[in-house]
């Protein structure tokens, strides 16, 4: 299962950690996709490491763990964020976070 804070807030110009926690006794995480609405933020692959989409490369830092640190937030970053955990043999699990960026 995926456990996450469904709603988080942060100040404009600040940073926030996007984190989904996956728990399973048997399944191994093979890939994690992070998206802002339908736009790719980053992908973690157990075989390749991290790939951060070029449009976010100056503001998105991998970690902690399989989460993301989103920096230099703007009001336009307000919205839905999705984590997708690809696991073997467990299948695919999805989590949703709503980020509200507040004026500083």
């Amino acid at each position: 299962t995926i456990d996450t804070k469904r709603n988080i807030s942060a100040e404009e110009g600040g940073s926030v950690i996007l984190q989904c926690h996956f728990s399973s006794d048997t399944a191994e995480v093979t890939q994690v996709d992070w998206k802002q609405q339908d736009q790719l933020l980053a992908i973690y692959s157990v075989d390749l490491g991290w790939h951060v989409a070029s449009v976010f490369s100056d503001r998105v830092v991998p970690g902690p763990s399989l989460g993301l640190t989103f920096q230099s937030l703007t009001m336009n970053d307000t919205g839905e964020y999705f984590c997708t955990y690809h696991t073997y043999p467990g299948g695919i699990y999805k989590g949703r976070i709503f980020l509200k960026v507040q004026e500083s």
Epitope: S45, D47, L48, G49, W50, H51, P62
Partner: antibody
Framework: QVQLVESGGGVVQPGRSLRLSCAAS????????MHWVRQAPGKGLEWVAV????????YYADSVEGRFTISRDNSKNTLYLQMNSLRAEDTALYYC????????????WGQGTMVTVSS | DIQLTQSPSSVSASVGDRVTITCRAS??????LAWYQQKPGKAPKLLIY???SLQSGVPSRFSGSGSGTDFTLTISSLQPEDFATYYC?????????FGGGTKVEIK
Amino acid sequence: QVQLVESGGGVVQPGRSLRLSCAASGFTFSSSYMHWVRQAPGKGLEWVAVIGADGSNKYYADSVEGRFTISRDNSKNTLYLQMNSLRAEDTALYYCAKPVPRRRGLDVWGQGTMVTVSS
Amino acid sequence: DIQLTQSPSSVSASVGDRVTITCRASQGISSWLAWYQQKPGKAPKLLIYGASSLQSGVPSRFSGSGSGTDFTLTISSLQPEDFATYYCQQAFYLPWTFGGGTKVEIK
């Protein structure tokens, strides 16, 4: 034994295209990520591209993005690198390589195939 | 992209010497660093992965250490067959990148 054999290199003019092949044997090709790495004459190693086991998850170095395409045919145990709009700076020995699963090191390499871009 | 800086770029040593090569990453890469040996006219050979794990079949005189941004490859007692060029490679971020290489030459 595990083996990778590249082919398809040669001399080509700038702006032209070339397709490299890498024939794999001795391991389960269809379950392995595969990489291309190149080495310009007298220079160091440069990672070029990678492709997922099922042909998805393709990634490229910035220097070749939009010009090179990595692909594979698992029924033929063969990896490909389609190189378009070739430049002089693409001149190099091109290696295909297999990674250690989950360890992100390249443990099996081919002998390389030489690509020379020159007018 | 992550830049890897190797030092020294070349080193002259004798058989039996202890040789240390360093690799510094421009950003933290956890322990996702590999080391390769390459001899003239040959393909690279994987020595170390995960910063410190010895690849199967590699002599125990080779060892790796480090995490974050600073890494070391050590050859405890240099053998004649060890004269070659050594490369580090990071695999924390795509694109994977290699260091510029360190040539180990006979003194």
